[in-house]
């Protein structure tokens, strides 16, 4: 029930919070789910547990996997799962969907972009901000605490914004970056029946057993900010949340982008450690707005 997706880049710091809460005084034990081996608490280790937090300083691709945390309260133990994926650094400027945090919307009056997950880290101001990989310069941009403020927002301010900061742990510094899309609310918008860009209907995707794979559901709904526009994955016609398999998770939040002026929404289904039984499932990409529902189905097949 309590599984949370976390992701990061190799050679950066990644800090993950146990999905089960508890008071700071409660002991939290962390384990590698596959081996049930306890994660050390000594800070000399590259990966170590610190109360409700699991720290990768820095992270490596091989750290990817599911981690179990057990909160030891005075009454009952409570268990959570952190599904961690560490990706290789991208050689080019492009930030793939699976590294994006939830999209934020802004307007002329309110244009705050918060740096995702920063509250988990021990950082000091100022933050560095980049748009589409270019460092932001000029008086319109103000880095304030953990967010960026843009003055006089215009439609071309929409794009992918990356915050970069330094996490300090016992005198050692580690870099962290996080990216999210920013959309600008356009008053002159319109809405239409959803058009699914990906996947193609009845598509088949080849996967390797034991590897991780991502399925992106992407749909466009009209122009400008949309009142109701959602995309989601279903497994065999059921919601992901009703499908109790911690390896298969839909990302929290949805990434909204503008393609040729159209409002498009993506959500990524992350499948860790692909198993044979995953090939038997029907994966439905659903796009829904006030005009109706469209569904595209994709299946997985074993790579020869």
């Amino acid at each position: 029930k309590f599984s949370k997706q976390s992701w990061g880049l190799e050679n950066e710091a990644l800090i993950v919070r146990c999905p089960r809460q508890g008071k700071s005084s409660y002991i939290v034990d962390w384990y590698y789910s596959q081996t049930n081996k306890s994660i050390p608490t000594q800070e000399r280790n590259r990966v170590f547990a610190s109360g409700q937090l699991l720290k990768f300083l820095p992270a490596e691709v091989a750290d990817s996997g599911i981690y179990t945390c057990i909160v030891r309260s005075p009454t009952f133990n409570r268990t959570g799962y952190a599904n961690v994926t560490i990706y290789k650094k991208q050689p080019d400027c492009n930030v793939p969907d699976y590294l994006m945090y939830s999209t934020v919307s802004g307007s002329e009056k309110n244009s705050k972009i918060y740096c995702p997950t920063i509250d988990l880290y021990n950082w000091t101001a100022p933050l560095e901000w980049f748009k589409n990989c270019q460092a932001l310069q000029g008086s319109r941009y103000k880095a304030h605490k953990s967010f960026l403020v843009i003055d006089n927002v215009m439609t071309d301010d929409a794009g992918d914004y990356t915050c970069k900061f330094i996490h300090n742990e016992n005198g050692a510094n580690y870099s962290v970056t996080a990216t999210r899309s920013f959309t600008v609310k356009d008053e002159q918008g319109f809405s239409r029946f959803p058009v699914i860009r990906a996947p193609a209907h009845n598509e088949t995707k080849e996967v390797e057993i034991g590897e991780n794979t991502n399925l992106t559901c992407s749909a466009c709904f009209g122009k400008g900010a949309q009142f109701l526009a959602t995309v989601q994955w279903q497994l065999n016609g059921n919601k992901i949340t009703d499908f109790s398999e911690p390896r298969i998770q839909q990302e929290e939040g949805q990434n909204q982008s503008f393609s040729n002026g159209l409002a498009c929404v993506n959500t990524v289904l992350r499948i860790a450690d692909v198993k044979e039984e995953d090939l038997l499932l029907r994966y439905d990409c659903l796009a829904l707005n006030l005009h109706g529902l469209r569904r595209h189905t994709i299946r997985l097949s074993r790579k020869n």
Partner: antibody, heavy 121, light 107 residues
């Protein structure tokens, strides 16, 4: 189907002893805490105590400590609540409820149908 | 023992109304709070656990929020079948304790 089935209604006299039961099925009985909750006529819910059938570990509310005994027989997947000497004030509906495993907990997620106990001279 | 104070003790609302019940703990209980529904003559039923998580199969019109000492339970659009008494319950410390209950009736 996960369920807890309780024994039938009881009518007793003050001073008599009583043992009511709660049979679990559809899940691993030894891995979950089972507890008892009292509801007096027209009143709210009161938590009495729990037992972990896997090792018979128990916890009690101070209000019920020494007043009742909670036990379990894992061979027949049944938990018990018993009194050695009933009082009129024990008249109530008694519910058993599942309280999560040794490693995880999500509230009292499965309840028995309740056993009415009436103590009257 | 941790005291749980629930309010109001009873309320009457129309079908479709938004209904809010509050629960206050006598000390910090993190998010270790559950909400139950008890219909007349029936056993209680778990609706929400850990303050805000909807139990499987429970309609989405039920929701919960809060942390620390102050918690809220909401029915976004009251339905005739929601006539019941609702209880909060803390499980941060033994003994587990329930609120006094809120009886919800239809106007």
């Amino acid at each position: 189907e996960v369920q807890l089935v309780q024994s039938g209604a009881e009518v007793k006299k003050p001073g008599e002893s009583l043992k009511i039961s709660c049979k679990g099925s559809g899940y691993s009985f030894t891995n979950y805490w089972i507890g008892w909750v009292r509801q007096m006529p027209g009143k709210g819910l009161e938590w009495m105590g729990i037992i972990y059938p896997g090792n018979s570990d128990t916890r009690f509310s101070p209000s019920f400590q020494g007043q009742v005994t909670i036990s379990a027989d894992k061979s027949i997947t049944t938990a018990y609540l018993q009194w050695s000497s009933l009082k009129a004030s024990d008249t109530a509906m008694y519910y058993c409820a599942r309280h999560g495993t040794s490693s995880d907990y999500y509230g009292l997620d499965v309840w028995g149908q309740g056993t009415t106990v009436t103590v009257s001279s | 023992d941790i005291q749980m104070t629930q309010s109001p003790s009873s309320l009457s609302a129309s079908v479709g109304d938004r209904v809010t019940i509050t629960c206050q703990a006598s000390q910090d209980i993190s998010n270790y709070l559950n909400w139950y529904q008890q219909k007349p003559g029936k056993a209680p039923k778990l609706l929400i656990y850990d303050a805000s998580n909807l139990e499987t199969g429970v309609p989405s019109r039920f929701s919960g929020s809060g942390s620390g000492t102050d918690f809220t339970f909401t029915i976004s659009s009251l339905q005739p079948e929601d006539i019941a008494t609702y209880y909060c319950q803390q499980d941060d410390n033994f003994p587990l304790t329930f609120g006094g209950g809120t009886k919800v009736e239809i106007k």
